[in-house]
């Protein structure tokens, strides 16, 4: 969370940004809020990126002004125009690229004053893992798969019954490069699993942490998975 103050004569407004992460190939949002000003005509939003000449995006007088937009962002940006008057200056970014990572500045000018705040935008790939029982294996095993990760993550297994146990000796993890030659598919197999136990497959890189849980009993298989972005907010 970054809060910036701007001073214009005696007037300054608070602008707040949140460190956020973009998932390569998907749409992302760079979050920025400011003190609302109900006069849309008087609001100017400028998004800038460190090291880039020209603007990422500009919104003023109720509409976008893309005349100074840098070509790497052409056709890829928008604001939530309906929400600008209530203080939402967040930027939407289409088809996030690895090269979109960096330091951005959200600059605001309203009838109340000026303000800006920086935002660190990380890019990578992250996806939910899915755990299944691998009936093909000679012994009962679990297969944890996640389709898209970058940078290469670490994978660890845990179990509810054997808390603190190290499963690295009884698991095998592989990373398979996807067709776009950036992201990778993660596959990890855990061998010699016991029934009536809950196992967790944890995948983590410097952007995200994902966990898949599976509970296997005689009568059913229960699954749950969650994904958490790191250092956001």
């Amino acid at each position: 969370l970054i809060i910036g103050f701007g001073i214009s004569g005696k007037h300054f407004i608070t602008v707040t940004t949140f460190t956020s992460a973009g998932n390569i190939g998907e749409d992302g949002t760079l979050s920025c809020t400011f003190e609302p000003d109900i006069k849309l005509n008087g609001i100017v939003i400028q998004w800038l990126k460190e090291g880039i000449k020209g603007l990422v995006h500009e919104f003023k007088e109720g509409k976008d002004d893309l005349s100074q937009q840098h070509e790497m962002f052409r056709g890829r940006t928008a604001v939530f125009a309906d929400q600008v008057v209530v203080g939402n200056a967040s930027l939407r970014l289409k088809n996030v690229q690895l090269t979109d990572a960096g330091t951005y500045t959200c600059y605001i000018r309203t009838s109340k004053g000026k303000g800006n705040a920086n935002l660190e935008y990380k890019t990578g790939a992250f996806s939910m893992p899915e755990i299944n029982v691998d009936y093909n294996a000679s012994s009962e095993s679990l297969r944890c798969e996640a389709p898209r990760w970058f940078p290469q993550p670490t994978v660890a297994w845990a179990s509810q019954v054997d808390q603190g146990a190290n499963f690295s000796e009884v698991s095998n993890t592989s990373f398979e490069l996807n067709s776009e030659n950036v992201t990778m598919k993660v596959v990890s197999v855990l061998y010699n699993v016991t029934i009536n136990n809950t196992y967790s497959c944890m995948i983590e890189n410097d952007i995200a942490k994902a966990t898949g849980d599976i509970k296997v009993t005689d009568s059913e298989v229960k699954r749950r998975s969650q994904l958490q972005l790191l250092n956001s907010g």
Epitope: D27, L40, F59, G62, K63, A78, V79, D82, V86, R92
Partner: antibody, heavy 115, light 107 residues
């Protein structure tokens, strides 16, 4: 000033489908949600739903789910509403609009369903 | 769905009179309310957005107030051009819903 220009009136047979358009000018198409509103003769206004031109995402009034399909063509800054399996109940004027901020409305498209 | 109860449904007022139309939401919608003016055979025209903000080109005799559940549109001094039907709209929660309308005529 932002303009929303809608296609002309349509006279349709029951059971037919119709696609009406709304072309936006003088603003970046992707930043505003495009809403559609129905007004039956002499009645109040009903919100049909909106389409998000940025990614094509939609939100519908449950009443119009399966009846209306909202789409966009970013290259021409045009939003469309497709109405299927028309009945006399679908007759009315349909407006495209921005709801908040620079809140503009198209001139309306009269759809008449009659045997 | 949020129900918007608008009153009165119709009214007569004299030129120069102060007119107030109200809209009550069935639940809290914060300031997500707009007011529209519609004349016969015309599309609605936005008067007020976010409960209190005057839309571009709208005369200053129009004003909006309220937040939460209770909202009002006031015309400080009625002019002949103000003959129209007025609608409120909540856009705080999907599906967005309109009030039933207030038909305003000159006495």
């Amino acid at each position: 000033q932002v303009q929303l220009q809608q296609s002309g009136a349509e006279l349709m047979k029951p059971g037919a489908s119709v696609k009406i358009s709304c072309k936006a000018s003088d603003y970046s198409f992707t930043s505003y949600y495009m809403h559609w509103v129905k007004q039956s003769h002499g009645k109040s206004l009903e919100w049909v739903g909106y389409v998000d031109p940025f990614n094509g995402g939609t939100s519908y009034n449950q009443k119009f789910k399966g009846k209306a399909t909202l789409t966009v063509d970013k290259s021409s800054s045009t939003a469309y509403m497709h109405l299927s399996s028309l009945t006399s109940e679908d007759s009315g004027v349909y407006y495209c609009a921005f709801i908040a901020g620079f809140a503009n409305w198209g001139q309306g498209t009269l759809v008449t369903v009659s045997a | 769905d949020i129900v918007m109860t608008q009153s009165p449904s119709s009214m007569y007022a004299s030129l120069g009179e102060r007119v107030t139309i109200t809209c009550k939401a069935s639940q809290d919608i914060k300031s997500y309310l707009s007011w529209y003016q519609q004349k016969p055979w015309k599309s609605p025209k936005t008067l007020i957005y976010y409960a209190t903000s005057l839309a571009d080109g709208v005369p200053s005799r129009f004003s909006g107030s309220g937040s939460g559940q209770d909202f009002s549109l006031t015309i400080s001094s009625l002019e002949s051009d103000d003959t129209a039907t007025y609608y409120c709209l909540q856009h705080g929660e999907s599906p967005y819903t309109f009030g039933g309308g207030t038909k305003l005529e000159i006495k």
